[in-house]
Amino acid sequence: HNTTVFQGVAGQSLQVSCPYDSMKHWGRRKAWCRQLGEKGPCQRVVSTHNLWLLSFLRRWNGSTAITDDTLGGTLTITLRNLQPHDAGLYQCQSLHGSEADTLRKVLVEVLADPLDHRDAGDLWFPGESESFEDAHVEHSISRSLLEGEIPFPPTS
């Protein structure tokens, strides 16, 4: 899996989207977990509704919400009131039994509020930036990546 970078501004909300094959993952609940180090476990933050048919209902754990569009094949995580401690490595997961398949590896980066001149440095518009091996990137970032630069090393 490549790592997708999502950048948000402290104090604001950040939406993370994880697309998946809706047929392949039919009937499976989803989860959002925090990677505790490159080789550490992925600690569950929040998971979708216990009843898969109700996965569209937003579930909260603290300031993190999850909702699943099972027909469209998009898992959406919302991090409300983003703060520096939210920065880190995460995974979107598809659950089956006691196993979990990784849908997407995510790096969340938290930028200081650009209106708060006390702490802001050089700020580009935040959002989603996904890198592929051919250096394609999405949305607004300050530069493209070099070929093969981002593929993330195995976590186990």
Partner: antibody, heavy 118, light 107 residues
Framework: QVQLVQSGAEVKKPGASVKVSCKAS????????ISWVRQAPGQGLEWMGW????????NYAQKLQGRVTMTTDTSTSTAYMELRSLRSDDTAVYYC???????????WGQGTLVTVSS | EIVLTQSPATLSLSPGERATLSCRAS??????LAWYQQKPGQAPRLLIY???NRATGIPARFSGSGSGTDFTLTISSLEPEDFAVYYC?????????FGGGTKVEIK
């Protein structure tokens, strides 16, 4: 294994600039940011700021705003911290750290002593 | 800016004794507080994150507690290698800040 190797000690005159480098290895450079922390002789730790190795976005500490610039070179997996208009109270050991200085698998450089003296 | 105040500044203890270090925040940082150990000539080493979770490879004699504004780092039985300076750090809000440190020295 993860390693951050910093450039050597520097002696600078007041008003000059210094640029400290931090070369990373053992992990995918752009999958983490780099923080800079400094420590004056016999004093505590001071967070200077952070740079995203992914796209160069930065957060700087207020007191250094306008004097500090953090950059990265992804082709060499190296981060740089430049501090301008040096004063004697900038004399410190400067550390780079992987991540926003609070990741669970934090890694630090060995430190670079910058001495500002006339 | 959140100010972290550590006490005492110096703690004089003997090996085998229990060390209790305090860190107080000027406003709530929830549980987003870390503890570091630093020995002379070395970079800081992460001991505790999120107030009470031990970092990888940190011995069980180190424990952290607290939330909001008051935090404690406890070393249950001091080993010779534990004599060092300890810093707390908050990552609740920008700018990230450190406490002034507590030096644990041999009595």
């Amino acid at each position: 294994q993860v390693q951050l190797v910093q450039s050597g000690a520097e002696v600078k005159k007041p008003g000059a600039s210094v640029k400290v480098s931090c070369k990373a290895s053992g992990y995918t450079f752009t999958s983490y940011g780099i923080s800079w922390v400094r420590q004056a002789p016999g004093q505590g730790l001071e967070w200077m700021g952070w740079i995203s190795a992914y796209n160069g976005n930065t957060n700087y500490a207020q007191k250094l705003q306008g004097r500090v610039t953090m950059t990265t070179d992804t082709s060499t997996s190296t981060a740089y911290m430049e501090l301008r208009s040096l004063r004697s109270d900038d004399t410190a050991v400067y550390y780079c750290a992987r991540g926003p200085s609070h990741y669970y698998d934090l890694a630090w450089g060995q430190g670079t002593l910058v001495t500002v003296s006339s | 800016e959140i100010v972290l105040t550590q006490s005492p500044a110096t703690l004089s203890l003997s090996p085998g004794e229990r060390a209790t270090l305090s860190c107080r925040a000027s406003q709530s940082v929830s549980s987003y507080l870390a503890w570091y150990q630093q020995k002379p000539g070395q970079a800081p080493r992460l001991l505790i994150y999120d107030a009470s979770n031990r970092a990888t490879g940190i011995p069980a004699r180190f424990s952290g507690s607290g939330s909001g504004t008051d935090f404690t780092l406890t070393i249950s039985s001091l080993e010779p290698e534990d004599f060092a300076v300890y810093y707390c750090q908050q990552v609740s809000n920008y700018p990230i800040t450190f406490g002034g440190g507590t030096k644990v020295e041999i009595k």
